[in-house]
């Protein structure tokens, strides 16, 4: 059998493999050692007994999408049946005091590979036995602690494979410089040690994406905006646009990145080297926001052009400048960079909102029949922008962290936006008051610290200072 017979359902073309050469990977036309690594089809009854106590699940994730030329990293995590885990020596043990369907286990080991390798590893003088090899016959790498690594992972994509010895979690990074753009499939087959051979325990596949567009995400936030995810924002308040470039392998770390913004409100193009920008819309309506990100990414250097062919006989005059085999436009950049672009587009709606709220006065309320321990305080509040429909107050400790009381109520406010909010305070002391005015689209907040003095029991009337 060949690797592609074992790892995939379809035979990949040599043409495809040639156009997607992965550094350090091997062609899946290579032979697979079926004696050492048996192959079971999906639905084979032997899968049921491939692991003691249940089935092992392999979880494959990647940091896709990857900008072409960058590295993409794949991580495989093995999820063992309930109550099983890998110990420091790479053995699979039962967790203490963990009860599964079979109850508590007397034997601490699910698989005691250390014991097996110590007493049954007949090796030759080189420390390399005939079974410590990968499916293609390549020997296991002998780095420190390799004996505690009891799983063989075979990664397969684009007609090529990569073998790795590991524990219950492995990570593989692939450079995408030669990968065809678009979605591609990564398949992983996992084997465990079994005497002097290996047994398949899990198979998993995942789609990853290679792109020539910089993956760009933009978060939009605005003070007083009630819902940051509905792409509706307020007029006359700055919106903060923050650009996140998905670049987990830091491929663009040394690139100069330019951000070109068009806010769709006839304010022209705005070019910045900062990933954060503020913009204020001064009109209501719907606007088309466009961002183009440009980065000079590291690129392969094209080979120098071949020397011009020798003319068959000497020519008396020099040819025109255009005959120069290395015309000016062909001189590669010193660092062979390629301009890469990313795009983001959004339609945002701008509406009226409450822009600002201020407490202009606080007054102790005169109480004819004083309560046992409470004080009433009036807050005179003004606002700018649209007219609020509700008011909320949150009363908390002086650090503004521990909420003691929160009350919301509808309000009817005139065009002048002047309102009085009355709230009760239990006992004397210093309080933090957060006062919020809201409507459908906005929520404006102001805070103040107030001191409520001790009550004078002899006096039933008290005025605020």
């Amino acid at each position: 059998k060949r690797f592609h017979d074992v790892l995939g359902n379809e035979r990949p073309s040599a043409y495809m493999r040639e156009h997607n050469q992965l550094n350090g990977w091997s062609s899946d036309e290579n032979d697979w050692n079926e004696k050492l690594y048996p192959v079971w089809k999906r639905g084979d009854m032997r899968w049921k007994n491939s692991w003691k106590g249940g089935r092992v699940q392999a979880v494959l994730t990647s940091d896709s999408p990857a900008l072409v030329g960058s590295n993409i990293t794949f991580v495989v995590n093995l999820v063992f049946p309930r109550c099983q885990k890998e110990d420091a020596n790479g053995n699979i043990v039962y967790e203490k005091n963990c009860r599964n369907e079979a109850g508590l286990s007397a034997d601490p080991y699910v698989y005691n590979w250390t014991a097996w390798s110590e007493d049954s590893d007949g090796e030759n003088g080189t420390g390399q036995s005939h079974h410590n090899v990968f499916p293609d016959g390549k020997p296991f790498p002998h780095h420190p602690g390799w004996r505690r690594w009891n799983f063989v992972y075979v990664f397969h994509t684009l007609g090529q494979y990569f073998q790795k010895l590991g524990r219950c979690s492995v990570r593989v990074s692939v450079n995408t410089a030669n990968v065809t753009l678009g979605p591609q499939l990564m398949e992983v087959t996992v084997y465990r040690r079994h005497g002097r051979a290996y047994v398949p325990i899990a198979q998993v596949k995942d789609v990853y994406v290679v792109t020539d567009q910089i993956p760009v995400f933009v978060t939009m936030s605005q003070k007083n905006d009630r819902n940051s995810s509905d792409e509706t924002f307020l007029k006359d308040l700055p919106i903060t646009f923050d650009v996140l470039i998905h670049d987990p392998s830091h491929f663009l770390n040394y690139s100069t990145i330019n951000y070109k913004w068009s806010f769709g409100d006839n304010t022209g193009l705005f070019v910045s080297i900062n990933h954060t920008v503020n913009h204020t819309y001064v009109l209501n309506g719907t606007f088309s926001l466009n961002l183009t990100v440009k980065a000079a990414a590291p690129g392969p250097c094209p080979p120098p052009p071949p020397p011009p062919p020798r003319p068959p006989k000497p020519t008396p005059s020099l040819g025109p400048a255009g005959d120069n085999p290395l015309g000016l436009s062909e001189i590669p950049d010193e660092n062979c960079q390629i301009n890469r672009y990313g795009h983001f587009q959004a339609t945002i709606t701008i509406v009226e909102g409450i822009l600002e709220v201020n407490i202009i006065q606080t007054t102790d309320v005169l109480m004819l029949v004083p309560g046992p321990d409470s004080s009433l305080i009036d807050f005179v509040v003004t606002c700018q922008g649209s007219i609020p429909t509700e008011v909320c107050t949150i009363i908390s400790d002086p650090t503004c962290e521990i909420t003691q009381n929160a009350v919301c109520s509808p309000v009817d406010v005139d065009e002048m936006c002047l309102l009085t909010v009355r709230r009760a305070f239990n006992g004397s002391g210093t309080y933090c008051v957060n006062l919020t005015l809201g409507d459908d689209t906005s929520l404006a907040l102001t805070s103040t610290l107030i001191s409520v003095p001790d009550r004078d029991p002899a006096s039933s009337l008290r005025m605020a200072n």
Epitope: G8, N9, E10, R11, P12, S13, A14, Y15, M16, E18, H19, N20, V68, L158, G159, A177, T180, L181, G182, P183, Q184, L185, E187, D212, G299, P300, C301, P302, P303, I338
Partner: antibody
Framework: QVQLQQPGAELVKPGASVKLSCKAS????????MHWVKQRPGQGLEWIGE????????NYNEKFKTKATLTVDRSSSTAYMQLSSLTSEDSAVYYC??????????????????WGQGTSVTVSS | DIQMTQSPASLSVSVGETVTITCRAS??????LAWYQQKQGKSPQLLVY???NLADGVPSRFSGSGSGTQYSLKINSLQSEDFGSYYC?????????FGGGTKLEIK
């Protein structure tokens, strides 16, 4: 839209060389391989070779290895094919064509999805 | 190199008829095949990729089929604009060779 522009015709003398150009627009030049194809009058299509527009890697039809040299200029998004030691056998229309890719399961598929108009090369003294 | 044998070399048909052009590869190419149309004095245009998938903008009267070494291109209810030459090309390995072509003429 995606376009490959080639000059209409070249008249060259036997034994000389000619450098044919193919200017790409409407797509990211470095993301695609470029192919070159020969068609003699009244004949079929003959594959010459291909070049990776990003790193300049080439593959040639054995028959054209000593005849054709493929290069690219990334800064102008232009692919070139130089034909040397020309004879009447080289009189033909030469096309550049972009290698398109299509997502398949589990592997991508390829085809020449965009062609230039072709350059007619006449070798005559 | 893989040899691509196209048949027939030429075909004379009337508008409205259905035609089938075949392409045989000298070895299994596992559906890595494209079909092109070339009109007189023009450059070729992609019709079908991966043996059965129509390229963008290609009318549905065209269809590709086949597997292994045998592939065909079928044109239902032939239109006047369909006359010209048709070529198959494999993408199994390098070089990706073309078939010899089929010339479709109006009867």
């Amino acid at each position: 839209q995606v376009q490959l522009q080639q000059p209409g015709a070249e008249l060259v003398k036997p034994g000389a060389s000619v450098k044919l150009s193919c200017k790409a627009s409407g797509y990211t030049f470095t993301s695609y391989w470029m192919h070159w194809v020969k068609q003699r009058p009244g004949q079929g299509l003959e594959w010459i070779g291909e070049i990776n527009s990003s790193n300049g890697r080439t593959n040639y039809n054995e028959k054209f290895k000593t005849k054709a040299t493929l290069t690219v200029d990334r800064s102008s998004s232009t692919a070139y094919m130089q034909l040397s030691s020309l004879t009447s056998e080289d009189s033909a229309v030469y096309y550049c064509a972009r290698l398109g890719y299509y997502s398949g399961s589990p592997y991508p598929y390829y085809a020449m999805d965009c062609w230039g108009q072709g350059t007619s090369v006449t070798v005559s003294s | 190199d893989i040899q691509m044998t196209q048949s027939p070399a030429s075909l004379s048909v009337s508008v409205g008829e259905t035609v089938t052009i075949t392409c045989r590869a000298s070895e299994n190419i596992y559906s890595n095949l494209a079909w092109y149309q070339q009109k007189q004095g023009k450059s070729p245009q992609l019709l079908v990729y991966a043996a059965t998938n129509l390229a963008d903008g290609v009318p549905s009267r065209f269809s590709g089929s086949g597997s292994g070494t045998q592939y065909s291109l079928k044109i239902n209810s032939l239109q006047s604009e369909d006359f010209g030459s048709y070529y198959c090309q494999h993408f199994w390995n390098t070089p990706p060779t073309f078939g010899g072509g089929t010339k479709l003429e109006i009867k």
